[in-house]
């Protein structure tokens, strides 16, 4: 057992990268990091589990963009990212570091997360060694970090496979060396097969020589897949540098925990029993207790190493560990040229003028998709539409009950009465017309226009 440790030194625009922060026009935000460790150097599917483990950093300090200011290195979370591993350290591994931004502004729905950068490195690393530094570019971003793997007592060695056993004596006896940091813990290093590479091999039993991943041969001197004689097997020939017939890669069964070995060109493959993973079945089963589901994924099953777990991912994430962000905007949900905004928990479509609806599917300028309520009719014209409302109704969709008298349509002190089909004006003495707009001369004749026959001054005038 042991711990992989990652220290982020800086994250910011690389040389020739973004001259301005990509945070412009956004509110305050803060960074956090996620690290994922996978055993082996092989190109793995993006959604394959972080079988060696994973960790999430704390949130960094809140950062607010200064408009027009050059983008500085961004404030980082405090502390190391630590990924505990159980059993052996594989020696070769894939390291995935994701830089996430959490926006804290007034955007709808609270904080929103977006992936700023993702770097993947395939590395060889012995446990117990010094910090290894690295600088990686991801687009316009540059990430500087260091990492190391260290064993946790009583495990020691380059693969954390040898165990320190406590000794009763306060000083170590002959042939025993101290297991730092405690003087009264000592280990007897197993005597490996003569000539076994100190750098690329290890042993748990005397006379054994087991290779770290990426190395092969009886003495672990031959890098996997680098020889020009991969069809042959055996120790390296001193004359040609090629392999000569000898022990096969499955000799001595390099597969741990009951795994079965089968030969592949120049190497071997372990078929692991349920609950074990890794090139040599050295990684024990991941359970829900290990927290394998990221980004708020819900882990079900996997109560013990022999039962599989399943991550139920929250919206916006997928993959067996919810480690892959879904780009739902790539599905082009926004219609009619709408702009898609992925808020993580939801999408937002910002519609062009003339369109509306959750996905801009509603054409506001189209009577076909437009309904005018209460018997109103839709009238198109000039690239737009309007509702011609039935009497007694108004508003954009004719949904509002109109008060025909609200606008005081009756002139010269006439009284307005609402009528089921409109309004009626009862004119004051001396006036007539639909809106009492015409004064009546003393001889009973209106000025303009002529009153319809049968109407006397003061009669109610109906206004259609």
């Amino acid at each position: 057992a042991g711990v992989f440790e990652l220290q982020i030194h800086s994250f910011g625009p690389g040389p020739g990268g973004a001259p301005r922060s990509p945070y412009s026009a956004r509110g305050p935000c803060r960074l956090f990091f996620r690290v994922c460790l996978k055993p082996g150097l092989s190109e793995e599917a993006a959604e394959s589990p972080c079988a060696l483990g994973a960790a999430l950093s704390a949130r960094g300090p809140v950062y607010t963009e200064q408009p027009e200011a050059p983008a500085p290195d961004l404030p980082l979370p405090n502390g190391l990212l630590q990924v505990p591993f159980r059993d052996a350290w594989p020696g070769t591994f894939s390291l995935i570091i994701e830089t996430w931004r959490e926006e804290l502004g007034d955007q709808i729905g609270g904080p929103a997360w977006s992936l700023l950068a993702r770097v993947t490195r395939r590395r060889r690393l012995a446990a117990g060694g010094p910090w290894a530094g690295d600088i990686q570019r991801a687009g316009a971003w540059e990430l500087r970090f260091s990492y190391r793997a260290r064993c946790e007592l009583p495990a020691v060695g380059t693969a954390c496979t040898r165990l320190c056993r406590p000794r009763s004596a306060s000083r170590c006896g002959p042939g025993l060396r101290p297991c730092a940091p405690l003087e009264d813990e000592c280990e007897a290093p197993p005597v490996c097969r003569a000539g076994c590479s100190l750098e690329h091999g290890f042993c748990e039993q005397p006379g054994e020589c087991r290779c770290l991943e990426g190395w092969t041969g009886p003495l672990c001197m031959v890098p996997v897949s680098t020889s020009s004689c991969l069809g042959l097997r055996g120790p390296s020939s001193t004359t040609t540098g090629c392999l000569v017939p000898g022990p096969g890669p499955c000799d001595g069964n390099p597969c741990a925990n009951g795994g079965s070995c089968s030969e592949t060109p120049g190497s071997f493959e372990c078929t692991c029993p349920r609950g074990f993973y890794g090139l040599r079945c050295e990684v024990s089963g991941v359970t829900c207790a290990d927290g394998p589901c990221f980004n708020g994924g819900l882990c079900v099953g996997g109560a013990d190493p022999d039962s599989a777990y399943i991550c139920h991912c929250p919206p916006g994430f997928q993959g067996s560990n919810c480690e892959k962000r879904v780009d739902r905007c790539s599905l082009q949900p926004c219609r009619n040229g709408g702009l898609c905004l992925d808020l993580g928990h939801a999408l937002r479509c910002r519609c062009r003028a003339g369109f509306a609806g959750p996905r801009c599917e509603h054409d506001l300028n189209d009577c076909a998709g437009r309904a005018c309520a209460n018997g109103g009719t839709c009238v198109e014209g000039g690239g737009a539409h309007r509702c011609s409302c039935a009497l007694g109704f108004g508003g954009r969709d004719c949904r509002e009950r109109a008060d025909p008298c609200a606008a005081r349509p009756c002139a010269h002190g006439g009284r307005c009465y609402a009528h089921f089909s409109g309004l009626v004006c009862a004119c004051a003495p001396g006036y007539m017309g639909a809106r009492c707009e015409f004064p009546v001369h003393p001889d009973g004749v209106s000025a303009l226009p002529a009153a319809p026959p049968g109407l006397r001054p003061g009669d109610p005038q109906r206004y259609p």
Epitope: G109, R328, L331, P333, R335, L347, G357, P358, R359, H362
Partner: antibody, heavy 118, light 107 residues
């Protein structure tokens, strides 16, 4: 956990009114369009209405226009459907459903039954 | 309004079978199609959106395909819990409309 709980169903006479409510929890209600969908007994699903996050846009199926009104109260995390001039054909289980943006209905309530009968 | 028609309206199958349900739109709807599962007395459950994208938490035994007017839902290795009614639904334009449903029964 996302939860939508409808209430307000019951027996109502033709021409009568009923107000349905949907209480939302487990998510930021004010960030989502919301929908009402109904299902007549033994029949299929029919979308009824939806409303924008801030209530500024509302859309209805033709058969309920002018009779039903969808509304929301973001402070109370609640969605409403005011149903007037009810008809026998409005008898159905009414579901509220959330629209996350990529498709209309990702989470549904358990439904509330409205029966229009004399 | 866009009409959605599903076929067959009912289907009998055995545990372990693979089945397909088809859905046809009366006019082109691009990939603006969703599939839902409903069990008696329960609310519908979202399975697939954008014609082929699996909703979060839905097992990969469900898959969707198609574009334009013709769409398919496939369910592999049927289990007892998969026997239910399945609906397709278009969200290309208002009003959103559903197919009439396909009832999947155990043989």
């Amino acid at each position: 956990e996302v939860q939508l709980v409808e209430s307000g169903g019951g027996l109502v006479q033709p021409g009568g009114s009923q107000r349905l409510s949907c209480a939302a929890s487990g998510f930021t209600f004010s960030s989502y369009w919301m929908n009402w969908v109904r299902q007549a007994p033994g029949k299929g699903l029919e979308w009824v209405a939806n409303i924008k996050e801030d209530g500024s846009e509302k859309y209805y199926v033709d058969s309920v226009k002018g009779r039903f009104t969808i509304s929301r109260d973001n402070a109370k995390n609640s969605l409403y459907l005011q149903m007037n001039s009810l008809r026998a054909e409005d008898t159905a289980v009414y579901y509220c459903a959330r629209d996350p943006g990529w498709a209309p209905f990702d989470y549904w309530g358990q439904g509330t039954l409205v029966t229009v009968s004399s | 309004d866009i009409q959605m028609s599903q076929s067959p309206s009912s289907l009998s199958a055995s545990v372990g079978d693979r089945v397909t349900i088809t859905c046809r739109a009366s006019q082109g709807i691009s990939n603006y199609l969703a599939w839902f599962q409903q069990k008696p007395g329960k609310a519908p459950k979202s399975l697939i959106y954008a014609a082929s994208s699996l909703q979060s938490g839905v097992p990969s035994k469900f898959s969707g395909s198609g574009s334009g007017t013709d769409f398919t839902l496939a369910i592999s290795s049927l289990q007892p819990e998969d026997f239910a009614t399945y609906y397709c639904q278009q969200y290309n334009s208002f009003p959103y409309t559903f197919g009439q449903g396909t009832t999947l029964e155990i043989k």
